[in-house]
């Protein structure tokens, strides 16, 4: 019996100011029960970028259909990205619980900004 | 097709025990989460206990006495029922766990039932 | 725990009528709204999920709506096969998943 994995194919990704970034992450199981979170960096200094649950992230928008049933594909998309978005972005499963605990995370994509094209 | 087909339903005395199975087909059945929903006679419908992987969620109701389990090489969901009380009478139903978008989880089939009677 | 209550509890309607039930959480649940139905002796029958979105095969009259709080389910001409009773349930913030106490929708 195979534990769910956390795939983020692209080590890395790189876009231009201004441009959006598609960050790729499906999952291979729909268990355990529990979220998707995504954060930028690793550690406790982490930084939240995209909670479907809870919170305003107005630049982040999810990449499958909202009503797309058994869905395992937790691809985000950021727009009008720019330097300070640089860095490693972390697609993590959480355990459902009181509170929820991290399960697994997949290896992280690393988000390059290059200037903008003049 | 999707079948739920539960099993061990019966008359059981207060405090007794009772083991009711779910034989599960027509999905892959260890990638889903799986549950049971209540129903006494009469009344509306009741969850009861969740699985996942090996997490597993229980109502307060039979909190410590029912343990929720599977068995993924068969294809079979369980419910261990422990110090049966009269209002455990009901039907319980198997559910096969759903999800939409980043969100879950709702009922998207349901076995036909087994009725579980707790009486002296 | 989030309640969900359901009105009215009991619905005398003639074939052909257009029946609205409501559901009210008591409180924010989103969209996270399923809709079953449940005929004597049968188990539940999931019609709508997301609060909005009809399952495979579930006849096109039958519709649901709204978010936050407050839910509907809308038939928009009753057949005579429709009549049991309907449950909405909550999956927003579990455990508990919570039901509705349900509305008994009678053939005139």
């Known amino acids: 019996e195979e534990e769910l994995q956390v795939i983020q194919p692209d080590k890395s990704v790189s876009v231009a100011a201004g441009e959006s970034a598609i960050l790729h992450c499906t999952v291979t199981s729909l268990i355990p029960v529990g979220p998707i979170q995504w954060f930028r960096g690793a550690g406790p200094a982490r930084e939240l970028i995209y909670n479907q649950k809870e919170g305003h992230f107005p630049r982040v928008t999810t990449v499958s259909e909202s009503t797309k049933r058994e869905n395992m594909d937790f691809s985000i998309s950021i727009s009008n990205i720019t330097p300070a978005d640089a860095g490693t972005y972390y697609c993590v499963k959480f355990r459902k619980g009181s509170p929820d605990t991290e399960f697994k995370s997949g290896a992280g994509t690393e988000l390059s900004v290059r200037a903008k094209p003049s | 097709e999707v079948q739920l087909v539960e099993s061990g339903g019966g008359v059981v005395q207060p405090g007794g025990s009772l083991r009711l199975s779910c034989a599960a087909s027509?999905?892959?059945?260890?990638?889903?989460?799986v549950s049971w929903v209540r129903q006494a006679p009469g009344k509306g419908l009741e969850w009861v206990s969740t699985?996942?992987?090996?997490?597993?969620y229980y109502a307060d109701s039979v909190k410590g006495r029912f343990t929720i389990s599977r068995d993924n090489s068969k294809n079979t969901l369980y419910l261990q029922m422990n110090s049966l009380r009269a209002e455990d009478t009901a039907v319980y139903y198997c559910a096969k766990d759903s999800t939409v978008g980043w969100s879950g989880d709702f009922f998207d089939y349901w076995g036909q039932g087994t009725l579980v009677t707790v009486s002296s | 725990e989030i309640v969900l209550t359901q009105s009215p509890a009991t619905l005398s309607v003639s074939p052909g009528e257009r029946v609205t039930l409501s559901c009210r959480a008591s409180q924010n649940v989103r969209s996270d709204i399923a809709w079953y139905q449940q005929k004597p002796g049968q188990a539940p029958r999931l019609l709508i999920y997301a609060a909005s979105s009809r399952d495979t095969g579930i006849p096109a009259r039958f519709s649901g709506s709204g978010s936050g709080t407050d839910f509907t389910l809308t038939i928009s001409s009753l057949q005579s096969e429709d009549f049991g009773v309907y449950y909405c349930?909550?999956?927003?913030?579990?455990?508990?998943?919570?039901f509705g106490g349900g509305t008994k929708v009678e053939i005139k």
């Open positions: 027509g999905f892959s059945f260890s990638i889903y989460a």
């Open positions: 699985i996942g992987a090996d997490d597993t």
């Open positions: 349930q909550q999956y927003y913030d579990w455990p508990p998943f919570t």
